[in-house]
């Protein structure tokens, strides 16, 4: 028979390779079936039969075709800082992500292994840089002329508000405090420019701190705790 | 990044041959088949044949059997498609692009080299 | 050898139009289709593998759908660097064939 007709199994000819979804069987010396993802062999091929292909057993799996005497195992149940966004089936593995609030400190081919809590940037301190899937909260010291006054991994500095007359002058966690019953007006949060305020506190315009790099965890570290990172605080 | 490059334009003449070069890079040369993909002008695509660059073994469709050979130097991750006995039907852009055997798909191609085969 | 054709050589959409392009087995190919992007002067694109798998980096406004004989590559809403010739191709015994492509214009 032409190769393009052969059943499985075949010799191939000299210097051909087997066709889709097959595999050369180097004790055969035949080209054999693979088994499709969910199966694996069963009974490997021999000169005159195929290869016997049988489901995966519960908790494992096989994701492409194959010729595996045994299926692989699914990773553990996820952790309760995780979410399962892929379940176990024959032909895939499970997949655990971090939960909303955590990142993915130490990743794995699929998934994460082991989840952080996000970084929350403490009072006078704001988001520099928010906390992906893969990479934590970074903080800096709120500048002259805007405040934080919460604990938050997502809330950044803002604005003073401007006053006509100022009663307490705000600070990096504190907003101003206007006597007249309402401020002229209110900066929008995240304005880049600060205009000159209308109020007795002087404010020097001057570069923002670099963000603060300091890892927000010490579980990767073999020495033991160490101090939370400048601008933010353990849970 | 993953890719093939081929090398330049040929123009031969009828019953002459051609041999067409694609260079990989950004992967394991020799995990990969590469396939060979052919388009006349204003056609549609027409597979050649594969080369499994770890051993060199082929697969050609029955249509080429005879006029074609595909080789590879793995030293160089180059894979190298010659086609013989030339004829006006053969002009036509040649692709290299890697291939996947169990779903049989494509899924990085070279730019392509233009073969003309005109007397 | 397996043929494959396509319902139509070339289709007229625009910009946001949800636009299918179906292409059909002469015989059953199970899953086995794959769509491709060609552009001129461009390399060919793979986008749709095994009927409906998403080649990665591919955008989620492209699908695929089918079986046996009968394919669809879905476009949801159609953005102006979509405009291209499509093929599919079937990937279930060899020969592996193409289809002739279709041509997606701007209308």
């Known amino acids: 028979l032409p190769a393009q007709v052969a059943f499985t199994p075949y010799a191939p000819e000299p210097g051909s390779t087997c066709r889709l979804r097959e595999y050369y069987d180097q004790t055969a010396q035949m080209c054999c079936s693979k088994c499709s993802p969910g199966q694996h062999a069963k009974v490997f091929c021999t000169k005159t039969s195929d290869t016997v292909c049988d489901s995966c057993e519960d908790s494992t799996y096989t994701q492409l075709w194959n010729w595996v005497p045994e299926c692989l195992s699914c990773g553990s149940r996820c952790s309760s800082d995780q979410v399962e966004t892929q379940a176990c089936t024959r032909e895939q593995n499970r997949i655990c992500t971090c939960r909303p609030g955590w990142y993915c400190a130490l990743s794995k081919q699929e998934g994460c292994r082991l989840c952080a809590p996000l970084r929350k940037c403490r009072p006078g301190f704001g988001v520099a840089r928010p906390g992906t899937e893969t990479s934590d909260v970074v903080c800096k010291p709120c500048a002259p002329g805007t405040f934080s006054n919460t604990t938050s991994s997502t809330d950044i500095c803002r604005p003073h508000q401007i006053c006509n007359v100022v009663a307490i002058p705000g600070n990096a966690s504190m907003d101003a405090v206007c006597t007249s019953t309402s401020p002229t007006r209110s900066m929008a949060p995240g304005a880049v420019h600060l205009p000159q305020p209308v109020s007795t506190r002087s404010q020097h315009t001057q570069p923002t701190p670099e963000p603060s790099t300091a890892p927000s965890t010490s579980f990767l570290l073999p020495m033991g705790p160490s101090p939370p990172a400048e601008g933010s605080t353990g849970d | 990044q993953v890719q093939l490059v081929q090398s330049g334009a040929e123009v031969k003449k009828p019953g002459a041959s051609v041999k067409v070069s694609c260079k990989a890079s950004?992967?394991?040369?020799?995990?990969?088949?590469i396939n060979w993909v052919r388009q006349a002008t204003g056609q549609g695509l027409e597979w050649i044949g594969w080369?499994?660059?770890?051993?060199?073994?082929?697969q050609y469709a029955q249509k080429f059997q005879g006029r074609v050979t595909m080789t590879r130097n793995t030293s160089i991750s180059t894979a190298y498609m010659e086609l013989s006995s030339l004829r006006s039907e053969d002009t036509a852009v040649y692709y290299c692009?890697?291939?996947?055997?169990?779903?049989?798909?494509?899924?990085?191609w070279g730019q392509g080299t233009t073969v003309t085969v005109s007397s | 050898d397996i043929q494959m054709t396509p319902s139509t050589s070339s289709l007229s959409a625009s910009v946001g139009d949800r636009v299918t392009i179906t292409c059909r087995a002469s015989?059953?190919?199970?899953?086995?289709l794959n769509w491709y992007q060609q552009k001129p002067g461009k390399a060919v694109k793979l986008l749709i593998y095994?009927?409906?798998k998403l080649h990665s980096g591919v955008p989620s406004r492209f699908s695929g759908s089918g079986s046996g004989t009968d394919f669809t590559l879905t476009i949801s809403s159609l953005q102006p660097e979509d405009f291209a010739t499509y093929y599919c191709?079937?990937?279930?015994?060899?020969?592996?064939?193409f289809g002739g492509g279709t041509k997606l214009e701007l209308k």
């Open positions: 692009a890697r291939g996947d055997r169990d779903y049989g798909y494509f899924d990085v």
């Open positions: 950004g992967y394991t040369f020799i995990t990969y088949d």
């Open positions: 080369i499994y660059p770890r051993d060199g073994n082929t």
């Open positions: 015989q059953d190919i199970s899953n086995y």
């Open positions: 095994f009927k409906s």
């Open positions: 191709q079937q990937g279930n015994t060899l020969p592996l064939t």
